[in-house]
């Protein structure tokens, strides 16, 4: 009984349960391939518990191994559109600090209109994740079609 | 030492480790786009620890943020079949209670024969998840090709 | 306070946080469809905390339910290449011990050049996971395009 009480009194943050699920806000200005994200219960089913948004990019607050996942659906798209506009590529990476810049996850659309994937990766406090969509096609802002999230898994 | 003993004595359920992985049982009757799921060790590698099945649909028993994942493969399918029968779309959503009805995850097959994705989403006790497959193509019942699951991540 | 101290003193391994993320090392020798994996911080962002590699295949060290995920991208590939070389299929399964041999996850490339999926599955200490790529196309060894991992979720 003592354990259960103690467990309830510990703030979740001390257990390292950082988690975020974001929805697309907008694409970047010209020559900026980044997608800009937003999150919060007022917006729907998106949320940030631990990580933060910095100008639409996700910043990590706790060191650890994270599961990073993403789905992006192109807005006005058929298999012929997708192949005609090829290559359309999505890359998720650490974009700052510059010393830790690296691509974590990369996918091309080819003849499809949706990409979805996930991976485990070590991230450090202060790492900012960017999602670059290169090509001429636009992403859907529907919250069930395009989303991006992270989940802290272990130290 | 006291902590370790206490931890072992606590039932797993009190840690909130609700998890389920389901295999396809059958498709719905005419005009019902829902897939009907089944789970349990006697069936293979599917299981329910916490959530329950209600007439083939998954019902959540614990509030929290969940990782929802799905893969659906079409049974008799080639890229030409898939494009000829387009649009074939899969949507995962909360279908009851009606007041919380919402689409969580949506994917189209386009020229592919498999879709797979995952996302984090808040779910509440009593939420029932439905998976709607619209189109004329049938899903494979092979357990390594078509499956649907949830994992409780945090309160 | 006693709880927090005790929690910090427990080795992570006792909490069952086994996790691994691997990068592609090489394809198999003659008539061997298996992909051979490697992991470790010296190689980049891959790691093994708990599971081990046995001749390039992933061996599980702790019983439990795991989230298994994979992404494989073909190296020289366009939608026309992929369809011309069809069927190219990836299967993840338990390959030893032979008594537990089973396919867990199967995907075909059809007209795409990347497959990505994930699933929950029970695994036991000593289970070895193999990833079989059948067909004539070659996988990319880029660490952001091809990776394979497992995460212990619960007992």
């Amino acid at each position: 009984q003592r354990f259960a009480q103690a467990q309830q009194q510990l703030p979740l943050e001390s257990l390292g349960w950082d988690v975020a699920e974001l929805q697309l806000n907008h694409t970047g200005p010209q020559q900026d391939p980044r997608l800009y994200w937003q999150g919060g219960p007022a917006l729907g089913r998106s949320f940030l518990h631990g990580p933060e948004l910095d100008k639409g990019q996700l910043r990590i607050h706790r060191d650890g191994i994270y599961m990073v996942h993403i789905q992006v659906t192109l807005a006005i798209c058929s298999s012929t559109t997708a192949s005609r506009h090829h290559p359309t590529t999505l890359a998720v990476g650490i974009c700052s600090p510059a010393s830790r810049s690296i691509s974590l996850l990369r996918l091309s659309f080819h003849q499809g209109c949706t990409i979805a994937s996930q991976r485990l990766t070590p991230l450090a406090r202060g790492d900012t994740l960017c999602t670059n969509l290169t090509g001429t096609l636009l992403p859907s802002r529907n919250t069930d079609e395009t989303f991006f999230g992270v989940q802290w898994v272990r130290p | 030492q006291r902590f370790a003993q206490a931890q072992q004595q606590l039932p797993l359920e009190s840690l909130g480790w609700d998890v389920a992985e389901l295999q396809l049982n059958h498709t719905g009757p005419q005009q019902d786009p829902r897939l009907y799921w089944q789970g349990g060790p006697a069936l293979g590698r599917s299981f329910l620890h916490g959530p329950e099945l209600d007439k083939g649909q998954l019902r959540i028993h614990r509030d929290g943020i969940y990782m929802v994942h799905i893969q659906v493969t079409l049974a008799i399918c080639s890229s030409t079949t898939a494009s000829r029968h387009h649009p074939t779309t899969l949507a995962v959503g909360i279908c009851s209670p009606a007041s919380r009805s919402i689409s969580l995850l949506r994917l189209s097959f386009h020229q592919g024969c498999t879709i797979a994705s995952q996302r984090l989403t808040p779910l509440a006790r009593g939420d029932t998840l439905c998976t709607n497959l619209t189109g004329t193509l049938l899903p494979s019942r092979n357990t390594d090709e078509t499956f649907f699951g949830v994992q409780w991540v945090r309160p | 306070q006693r709880f927090a101290q005790a929690q910090q003193q427990l080795p992570l391994e006792s909490l069952g946080w086994d996790v691994a993320e691997l990068q592609l090392n090489h394809t198999g020798p003659q008539q061997d469809p298996r992909l051979y994996w490697q992991g470790g911080p010296a190689l980049g962002r891959s790691f093994l905390h708990g599971p081990e590699l046995d001749k390039g295949q992933l061996r599980i060290h702790r019983d439990g339910i795991y989230m298994v995920h994979i992404q494989v991208t073909l190296a020289i590939c366009s939608s026309t290449t992929a369809s011309r070389h069809h069927p190219t299929t990836l299967a993840v399964g338990i390959c030893s011990p032979a008594s537990r041999s089973i396919s867990l996850l199967r995907l075909s490339f059809h007209q795409g050049c990347t497959i990505a999926s994930q699933r929950l599955t029970p695994l036991a200490r000593g289970d070895t996971l193999c990833t079989n790529l059948t067909g004539t196309l070659l996988p990319s060894r880029n660490t952001d395009e091809t990776f394979f991992g497992v995460q212990w979720v619960r007992p």
């Epitope: - | - | 394809t27 198999g28 962002r45």
Partner: nanobody, 125 residues
Framework: QVQLVESGGGLVQPGGSLRLSCAAS????????MGWYRQAPGKQRELVAA???????NYADSVKGRFTISRDNAKNTVYLQMNSLKPEDTAVYYC???????????????????WGQGTLVTVSS
């Protein structure tokens, strides 16, 4: 620039044998795989056999048991031993190489595909 030079084609009677060779030269970083494709008149180019740098081999169903692919890594050369040849094996045979160029830290691989000019194999009595 990488070049592939094929040799060994020619006219052979049904049931006979031929050995094709393909040598890669130029600024080769690493050959990931080499293989042979063929194209018969009015048909699409199809894979005959391929071999990876780890020794993995793949054969078209139509040539299994008759053709053998092998590779000499030191010479950057691939061979195709063709036995029990049939009239339907008549085609232009093309050598193919997939190059893997590694650069940077962390390593990033760039994949390139190179084709030979082709060598004609005619199986006829």
């Amino acid at each position: 620039q990488v070049q592939l030079v094929e040799s060994g084609g020619g006219l052979v009677q049904p049931g006979g044998s031929l050995r094709l060779s393909c040598a890669a030269s130029g600024s080769i970083f690493s050959i990931y795989a080499m293989g042979w494709y063929r194209q018969a008149p009015g048909k699409q180019r199809e894979l005959v056999a391929a071999i990876t740098n780890s020794g993995g081999t793949n054969y078209a169903d139509s040539v299994k048991g008759r053709f053998t692919i092998s590779r000499d890594n030191a010479k950057n050369t691939v061979y195709l031993q063709m036995n029990s040849l049939k009239p339907e094996d008549t085609a232009v045979y093309y050598c193919n190489a997939v190059l893997e160029q590694a650069s940077g830290d962390p390593v990033v691989y760039r994949y390139l595909e190179v084709w030979g000019q082709g060598t004609l194999v005619t199986v006829s009595s």
